[in-house]
Interface confidence: low
Amino acid sequence: QEGKFSGPLKPMTFSIYEGQEPSQIIFQFKANPPAVTFELTGETDNIFVIEREGLLYYNRALDRETRSTHNLQVAALDANGIIVEGPVPITIKVKDINDNRPTFLQSKYEGSVRQNSRPGKPFLYVNATDLDDPATPNGQLYYQIVIQLPMINNVMYFQINNKTGAISLTREGSQELNPAKNPSYNLVISVKDMGGQSENSFSDTTSVDIIVTENIWKAPKPVEMVENSTDPHPIKITQVRWNDPGAQYSLVDKEKLPRFPFSIDQEGDIYVTQPLDREEKDAYVFYAVAKDEYGKPLSYPLEIHVKVKDINDNPPTCPSPVTVFEVQENERLGNSIGTLTAHDRDEENTANSFLNYRIVEQTPKLPMDGLFLIQTYAGMLQLAKQSLKKQDTPQYNLTIEVSDKDFKTLCFVQINVIDINDQIPIFEKSDYGNLTLAEDTNIGSTILTIQATDADEPFTGSSKILYHIIKGDSEGRLGVDTDPHTNTGYVIIKKPLDFETAAVSNIVFKAENPEPLVFGVKYNASSFAKFTLIVTDVNEAPQFSQHVFQAKVSEDVAIGTKVGNVTAKDPEGLDISYSLRGDTRGWLKIDHVTGEIFSVAPLDREAGSPYRVQVVATEVGGSSLSSVSEFHLILMDVNDNPPRLAKDYTGLFFCHPLSAPGSLIFEATDDDQHLFRGPHFTFSLGSGSLQNDWEVSKINGTHARLSTRHTEFEEREYVVLIRINDGGRPPLEGIVSLPVTFCSCVEGSCFRPAGHQTGIPTVGM
């Protein structure tokens, strides 16, 4: 059968499963004269044979783990044994079967974890190897916790990353682990090949001993410090402690106070450095930070609360040098005249600020003493004995003692006896007509003057007039100020006028006295006036519904995908045209009519996220006014960056000759987002031919060790290719090269004769 199993001499590749006894030939090569026989060379390992007539076969089972690819050459010879065709490469790829079990690198692991460590943060890695092909399920390892001892309430405190073997705390473990209750745990971990998915997978187990260490980095209890302390300062008030010696402590004042009266020493003891004043500040909240020797925070800051305790260090104070009240003639007994409200700066609702009021003197004592009384705790003055007559005594002066538990203060009250309030205010006009204003009239403008008069005693509460707008201005756009000498009212604009919501307002004013009217007298129509405010339109710019619009898309969205939209409205109802400003990367376009935003180019989170542009809304027609808002596009990460070396590793060297196998450590990174747990790269040699000389082993998710397998290296540079896989979705792989020089050394450095100084390696192993 020409074609599948026979044919002319040409480069060919065959795939054969390992571990299977030969059951058929590989290929029958046909000779073209003058060729008469065939010869096989290369990596035959005494397994591959070609008969003189061109029949290529193998004589025993292959082992991929011994050699994954056999590079053979076949040549055609003439009758004299001279090559007349070829040699051509024949590649035998050995396909993997699951004939190796995974094995843990250690039969027992030991680790420690601090209580309250962050859940999901690895504190220990277990590592197993399987000689089968990692690109197939045969070599894909799956880690599992078989048992946790002890197991409390059936709750797992530990978890393992099935792929990487990283052991971390669960949320429950972070919250509940307590070395005082249980200082150590044992985990039995299994590893299975076939990705853990097959009944026929091989497995291995290992034991992990975990010590739980106490986390003493805890916020101390809130501190209470008495104000105005006379003890020598600084005074230790509390302390924090990092878990290990050598931390550098500092305090952070989040409030940025002009005077920050606290300090911390290098033991973590916290001091108050000067007396505190509760009346200046009654509580402090600040943070204690622990940093390592490089100034990097070791953990989250701790919140320190200091409450300043009050002492009675403030006397009562009067509201003003003299407090003036008015009382109408003929007011009835018990009527309230007014309330004296003294103050005390000490802590509210405590004995230190609880005030008592007492009248200590009344002058004149006409027609008798004791005309007034004051409520002991409320400070309210009342008429005690009889109605007053202005013609007898127009004014009384009271001295009132106000006291807290330690201090007394005298306050003075003047009580003016005034005419009875039997006259109502009367507007000079009942209708102030129409007023037309543009909607952009300035706030604070006086737009109208109104006037009412009151025939009661001048310059008393009976004749003083207060104006209120009682109708037509529910938004509170207008207000009325009164001139106390003339009782003239000035109507002013307090909030912007708005044609769109209130083009016409029918305003009603009421004029009234601060003093109550005497019994039987009521306000009537004379105390009311009206006024009509007409607001004219001013063309205004469109208004966006938000100051900032935000949208979130994956960085790999197809070109033309809608990524967001913005909306604006024109107060006058005109149509709006949308445009973009500041699209520096040329990634976006906006639909002028709808405000929908689309991608017009490939997006890239690594170039910067969020991507910020401005959106402009412009009136169509009218005066083309416009306004601007922000559009922020948050780009979500896609695994689109292959791993690479974290830094430049030129200059790695070993001193030649090697006295023992050596190793070096390198670090990988990639530009994708690695939330919480960081990258988890896997490392392997970049080509099979390197495996005799080199070995690569993973240290953690970002670092690996490259080791020599022997000491027989030439004195030259070797370029070691390393394959780094990021295990992402989809997984991306980078092949990087580590140049390693073997060189003669003088005092631990590469020796180069004068004139050969270029490219001297700088890192010795």
Epitope: K108, E110, S112, R114, P183, S184, D209, I211, T213, N243, D244
Partner: nanobody, 115 residues
Framework: EVQLVESGGGLVQAGGTLRLSCAAS????????LGWYRQAPGNQRELVAN???????SYADSVKGRFTISRDNAKNTVFLQMNNLKPEDTAVYYC?????????WGQGTQVTVSS
Amino acid sequence: EVQLVESGGGLVQAGGTLRLSCAASGIRFSFYALGWYRQAPGNQRELVANMTSGGSTSYADSVKGRFTISRDNAKNTVFLQMNNLKPEDTAVYYCNAGGARLGYWGQGTQVTVSS
């Protein structure tokens, strides 16, 4: 409360022998890696000998062949047998459980080797 109490230090002639003991309480002793560290005046604390919970041992180069670390899990005690002592072995010797970075420390015992 965790406590590590060292004993067995003292003054000895060069070439002599001492056996240090460290009794532990308050910890699950058999689960801890145990170590002896020392600190001479003006120097940093350095590891002398270490033994993992599995029984693997390691020693500082300067004491290899002369010092031996051992442990008795039943008695919650770790030992350091010091033979052929030299003047440069003079230091305060500290017992440690759980490692220098995260573990627990004893108060230390003085070892003085005179020439």
